[in-house]
Interface confidence: medium
């Protein structure tokens, strides 16, 4: 299974549901289907209120039963560990794959945690995080923000994914905007130096 790198904002915007939840145990194979399901305990819903309607929560996360079909394999044995899960809604059920944005909540930077709760939503449907695969990259539209973490950091985990969101600057322009939470190392040019 091959997954394209995803900026957290893209994961948020492209998902039907974004929740915080704990995994309660091993997966259960669903007979006669190619799916298995993990029992989860949802602690907070961050996106999907409209899609879910009056449902009170999700007890299961469904995923393909085989890794070759991009099935998600949950490796942590810690049932008290909280995860951020960005998934799709199918037939009223939460579906995830190996490519889903699914990470321990505490692994997210404070800026990302804040953004998942309230900031990323402001860019959905308006702004696009545009991955840069070779320098120089070209912005195809003023509603795009160039995402350069992969080429400069060799990973999708970099300054832009950790500390920036692509948000509307005005009705015709989206730009990277600093999420304003202190960082462990100084960010080049993100603040004035006295």
């Amino acid at each position: 299974c091959s997954c394209a790198p995803t900026h957290p904002q893209t994961a948020f915007c492209n998902s039907d549901l974004v929740i915080r939840a704990k995994f309660m145990g091993s997966p259960e194979i669903i007979e006669t289907t190619l799916y298995q399901r993990y029992e989860i305990k949802m602690t907070k819903m961050l996106k999907g209120f409209d899609a879910v309607g009056n449902a009170t929560g999700f007890r299961f996360a469904y995923t393909p039963a085989m890794e070759s079909l991009c099935g998600y394999v949950h490796k942590s044995q810690n049932r008290s560990e909280e995860f951020l899960i960005a998934g799709r809604l199918r037939n009223g059920n939460l579906h995830i794959t190996a490519c889903s944005f699914l990470v321990p909540w505490h692994n997210l930077s404070p800026a990302q945690q804040k953004a998942f709760v309230k900031t990323y939503s402001a860019g959905c449907g308006v702004c696009t995080v545009f991955p840069c695969s070779a320098i120089p990259c070209k912005l195809e539209s003023d509603s795009h923000c160039l995402w350069t973490d992969q080429i400069l950091m060799g990973s999708e985990k970099g300054y832009q994914s950790d500390h920036f969101a692509c948000l509307p600057r005005n009705p015709d322009l989206c730009t990277w905007q600093y999420l304003g939470v202190s960082m462990t190392r100084s960010l080049p040019l993100a603040k004035a130096e006295a």
Partner: antibody, heavy 119, light 108 residues
């Protein structure tokens, strides 16, 4: 195609100031960092400082702190570098260069502006 | 400040030969933050390599970069006439974002 077009050559007296402009076209000005790099005759490259237009705040190399001011005007997609208290050793070609936020990797450069400081 | 020391200062080679340029940092630099530029007389620098080893768009395959930590190398596998120029390494790991003093590759 991205272009950075700088203002023309300047001759200045010691103690005076110079302000060089850098007008960007062909790209989204606000989505990048603009840095200034200088090169004295026959010498290497020296980063002076830079600005991210959407933040409006700049940072500077310690060497130039207090003498250089970098600003940006989003409405005209133009960045400016002003250097004060000029001395003869400030004679150099001054380049503006575009970098990806929040990185200082310069993929496009202006043509350079020669500033000569002479009495 | 991170000091980048390039060697040799001048490299005299003939077209078709291999050029190996060195850049040594005074302290460790993440390879993600190391770039190489080419500058010809009267022109602005041109980005060649970023992330220590990735070629910028339009840069011929004869240019390659390698290294990590404090030692980085730019290699030109077979010099073409247009490759004779000055080459600079740059770090953008920490402010101020410093350049090496340059290596001039000249025709022998």
């Amino acid at each position: 195609q991205v272009q950075l077009v700088q203002s023309g050559a300047e001759v200045k007296k010691p103690g005076s100031s110079v302000k060089v402009s850098c007008k960007a076209s062909g790209g989204t000005f606000s989505s990048y960092a603009i840095s200034w790099v200088r090169q004295a005759p026959g010498q290497g490259l020296e980063w002076m400082g830079g600005i991210i237009p959407i933040f409006g705040t700049a940072n500077y190399a310690q060497k130039f702190q207090g003498r250089v001011t970098i600003t940006a005007d989003e409405s005209t997609s133009t960045a400016y570098m002003e250097l004060s208290s000029l001395r003869s050793e400030d004679t150099a070609v001054y380049y503006c260069a575009r970098g990806y936020i929040p990185y200082h990797l310069f993929d496009y450069w202006g043509q350079g502006t020669l500033v000569t400081v002479s009495s | 400040d991170i000091v980048l020391t390039q060697s040799p200062a001048t490299l005299s080679l003939s077209p078709g030969e291999r050029a190996t340029l060195s850049c040594r940092a005074s302290q460790s630099v993440s390879s993600s933050y190391l770039a190489w530029y080419q500058q010809k007389p009267g022109q602005a620098p041109r980005l060649l390599i970023y992330g220590a080893s990735s070629r910028a768009t339009g840069v011929p395959a004869r240019f390659s970069g390698s290294g990590s930590g404090t030692d980085f190398t730019l290699t030109i596998s077979s010099l073409e006439p247009e490759d004779f120029a000055v080459y600079y390494c740059q770090q953008f790991n920490d402010s101020p974002y410093t350049f090496g003093q340059g290596t001039k590759v000249e025709i022998k």
